[in-house]
Interface confidence: low
């Protein structure tokens, strides 16, 4: 099974070769290269020198080879970079090239969503309801769930809204939001609202959004 690697959008992924080099072979005897599952070459070290004529344009200038750890570093990661990679090492002998090592890696590219933000899109209407939107942007992969917590002095209610999502055509990052109409005809205490975004690995919480309810005014004195 391929080695699973996780790295972050716009950062660097380490694609290892995990070559023990028990024979203590010099790079000058070896041909080391990485390819993706489309057989496009990311990097080639040919007898100790980096060779660029075989590197595909989408990887050009984005890799660096660490000869100490036999690891290829893929920089400026894009979501499109996720998938399978192979490191292949050949020993160049007078009789020809002999493959002496190969290693498969499966790269996942992640992007952290921003802290969810609650924005009111209407004012409190006669203390009956308020329209809210909660949004979080620039994440990957798409989150599992987005919800809103309404907390009063006496209770906590969770609303699971319908999550709207959009994906950027270029970066493939997701923006997500939910809209909610919060009604509180019977609420007489102040209320705090939180927005929660759940991904496979994290749970992001918005800053609290507070609604201060005015105390009801006493009725005017009845004048006969």
């Amino acid at each position: 099974a391929p080695l699973k690697i996780q790295a972050y959008f716009n950062e660097t992924a380490d694609l290892p070769c995990q070559f023990a080099n028990s024979q203590n072979q010099s790079l000058s005897e070896l041909v080391v290269f990485w390819q993706d599952q489309e057989n496009l070459v990311l990097n080639e070290v040919y007898l100790g020198k980096e060779k660029f004529d075989s590197v595909h344009s989408k990887y050009m200038g984005r890799t660096s080879f660490d000869s100490d750890s036999w690891t290829l570093r893929l920089h400026n990661l894009q979501i499109k970079d996720k998938g399978l990679y192979q490191c292949i090492i050949h020993h160049k002998k007078p009789t020809g090239m002999i493959r002496i090592h190969q290693m498969n890696s499966e790269l996942s590219v992640l992007a952290n969503f921003s802290q969810p933000e609650i924005v009111p899109i209407s004012n409190i209407t006669e203390n009956v309801y308020i329209n809210l939107t909660c949004s979080s942007i620039h994440g990957y992969p798409e989150p599992k769930k987005m919800s809103v917590l309404l907390r009063t002095k006496n209770s906590t209610i969770e609303y699971d809204g319908v999550m709207q999502k959009s994906q950027d055509n270029v970066t493939e990052l997701y923006d997500v939001s939910i809209s909610l109409s919060v009604s509180f005809p019977d609420v007489t205490s102040n209320m705090t609202i939180f927005c929660i975004l759940e991904t496979d690995k994290t749970r992001l919480l918005s800053s609290p959004f507070s609604i201060e309810l005015e105390d009801p005014q006493p009725p005017p004195d009845h004048i006969p």
């Epitope: 290269f33 599952q37 057989n39 996720k82 998938g83 399978l84 292949i88 002999i98 499966e106 996942s108």
Partner: antibody, heavy 116, light 112 residues
Framework: QVQLVQSGAEVKKPGSSVKVSCKAS????????IQWVRQAPGQGLEWIGV????????NYNQKFKGKATMTVDKSTSTAYMELSSLRSEDTAVYYC?????????WGQGTLVTVSS | DIVLTQSPDSLAVSLGERATISCKSS????????????LAWYQQKPGQPPKLLIY???TRESGVPDRFSGSGSGTDFTLTISSLQAEDVAVYYC????????FGQGTKVEIK
Amino acid sequence: QVQLVQSGAEVKKPGSSVKVSCKASGYTFTDYAIQWVRQAPGQGLEWIGVINIYYDNTNYNQKFKGKATMTVDKSTSTAYMELSSLRSEDTAVYYCARAAWYMDYWGQGTLVTVSS
Amino acid sequence: DIVLTQSPDSLAVSLGERATISCKSSQSLLNSRTRENYLAWYQQKPGQPPKLLIYWASTRESGVPDRFSGSGSGTDFTLTISSLQAEDVAVYYCTQSYNLYTFGQGTKVEIK
């Protein structure tokens, strides 16, 4: 664990269409291609085509161009193959398979019978 | 299109004996850069989907018994079952992924 689960057997009239589904689980759906292969009764394996889910591109065996259409729904990790203008010679078991450099996991197969 | 031709079409071998299947390609399947031969072998039993045995001509898939081995390079490839067992009765297919995909016509292995 990796699984490809295909839709059930279909009986179709000549001239009609059929859409076979292949639901993937246990791996990242977009990281692999899906191949479609058919096997007529008592015959060998015949490659229909491949859809590279991540890059959204398809390649068809020349024989199946215009006959088969491969699509995917990434939101449900499901691949589909639609066969049009069915004839009796399209009666076969249709397989989907996960592939990168080779086909390592296969669906259980879907029998499509074309009969008037 | 690349054509794969298997021989023989069927093969009867005694239990414990060696079975050898040949697969010839109409063009080389050797990727000169990776030194990989883009050829795989599959086993198919009645009523079941094919099962991957060997890929890159000679690499055994994990969980496949070591009596199965693949060899060859370029255009000529061989699948060998060193000591045939009853559960090896099946049809065996070679397939190339050098240029899209094609299958050989299959070789049926039976017990003599």
